[in-house]
Interface confidence: medium
């Protein structure tokens, strides 16, 4: 057998809705043969399936077979070196995966201008590896909430940060005018979930879009 | 009526924190957007932070990068205002300022939405 290879140092779960994704940290001096095998165990099976002999990369997408992953008690994931012949032992994640362990998102932000208020439209997210039935609000389908961070450019401040309810809300601008730039981070009241905010969404705010009233 | 009157002022070193405190008495606070304004020696007083009457929305000026939270007690009709990693450019008098209205709008931003004003805390940041 010859020396024994050294296990890699760390396993972790990153994911986000429906894109389920392990990652390990090589191991020292390894050499160009050296591959990954990757197994998962679901709990109340209690029996490790080997996902992937030989993987060359540090990562392995699990979305596939953890499709089942928001109705079910989660999964462990375990990983080893392999060179030739010779295999280390293995390593596994420290901590259970479950849908505590996703990390939420929005699929998007839609801003649009009516007399002076900014209005905004939270799009969820819509994974093209998720089961019909299985959309962000069925599976979050109470408590949904979402920090509001926008920044004014130019301006005399930075942010405001509101927590609303709901996919959608409004801003009145007060007569401001500039370009309004919008981010959108998730959450759920009854979850401990993180959550990711969105890449900024960015609309100008000009004179015209004022109505005058009498 | 509200009366507002600031405390928690004070010397302080570069990088140091002071948590500003503005209680509130006279009509009821829950239902005002309160905030805090600052004026540095010289200068025309600039918006600082602001949070509307149940918390759920916080404002702030550019230059607080992230050092300052604002927080308030309706129970006990206070404002508050942690500032952590103090410049200098940070000193000035600190006033406490209390708007009408609970829509989530840029008016309080503006010195002119606020109807009810604290006589302010001064606050030096030196070494």
């Known amino acids: 057998h010859g020396t024994e290879l050294p296990s890699p140092p760390s396993v972790w779960f990153e994911a986000e809705f429906f894109h389920h994704i392990l990652h390990w940290t090589p191991i020292p001096n390894q050499s160009e043969s050296t591959c990954y095998e990757v197994a998962l165990l679901r709990y109340g099976i209690e029996s490790w399936n080997s996902i992937s002999n030989c993987s060359q990369t540090l990562s392995y997408d699990l979305t596939a077979v953890t499709l089942d992953l928001y109705h079910s008690n989660g999964y462990r994931a375990r990983v080893r070196a392999v060179d030739g012949s010779r295999h280390s032992n293995w390593t596994v994640t420290n901590t259970r995966f479950s849908v505590d362990e996703v990390t939420l998102t929005v699929g998007s932000v839609n801003l649009e201008i009516h007399n002076g208020f900014i209005l905004g439209k939270i799009q969820l997210p819509r994974p093209k590896m998720a089961p019909a039935n299985d959309t962000y609000e069925s599976i979050f389908s109470h408590f949904r909430e979402y920090e509001i961070a926008i920044r004014k450019v130019p301006g005399n401040f930075t942010f405001t940060h509101k927590k609303v309810k709901h996919e959608n809300f409004s801003l009145l601008t007060s007569g401001e005018v500039g370009e309004f730039c919008v981010q959108v981070k998730p959450s759920v009241a009854s979850r401990s979930n993180k959550g990711m905010w969105s890449k900024e969404e960015c609309i100008s705010l000009t004179r015209q879009y004022f109505t005058v009233t009498n | 009526e509200v009366q507002l009157l600031e405390s928690g002022g004070g010397l302080v070193q570069p990088g140091g924190s002071l948590r500003l405190s503005c209680a509130a008495s006279g009509r009821t606070f829950s239902s005002h957007t309160v905030g805090w304004f600052r004026q540095a020696p010289g200068k025309g007083r600039e918006f600082v932070s602001a949070?509307?009457?149940?918390?759920?929305?916080?404002y702030f000026g550019d230059f607080v990068e992230g050092r300052f939270t604002i927080s308030r007690d309706n129970s006990k009709n206070t404002l508050y205002l942690q500032m952590n990693s103090l410049r200098a450019e940070d000193t000035a008098v600190y006033y406490c300022?209390?708007?009408?209205?609970?829509?989530?709008?840029?008016?309080?931003?503006?010195?002119?939405?606020?109807?009810?004003w604290g006589q302010g805390t001064l606050v030096t940041v030196s070494s």
């Open positions: 949070i509307t009457w149940n918390g759920d929305t916080t």
């Open positions: 300022a209390a708007a009408t209205g609970q829509v989530w709008s840029l008016q309080y931003l503006r010195e002119s939405s606020y109807a009810y």
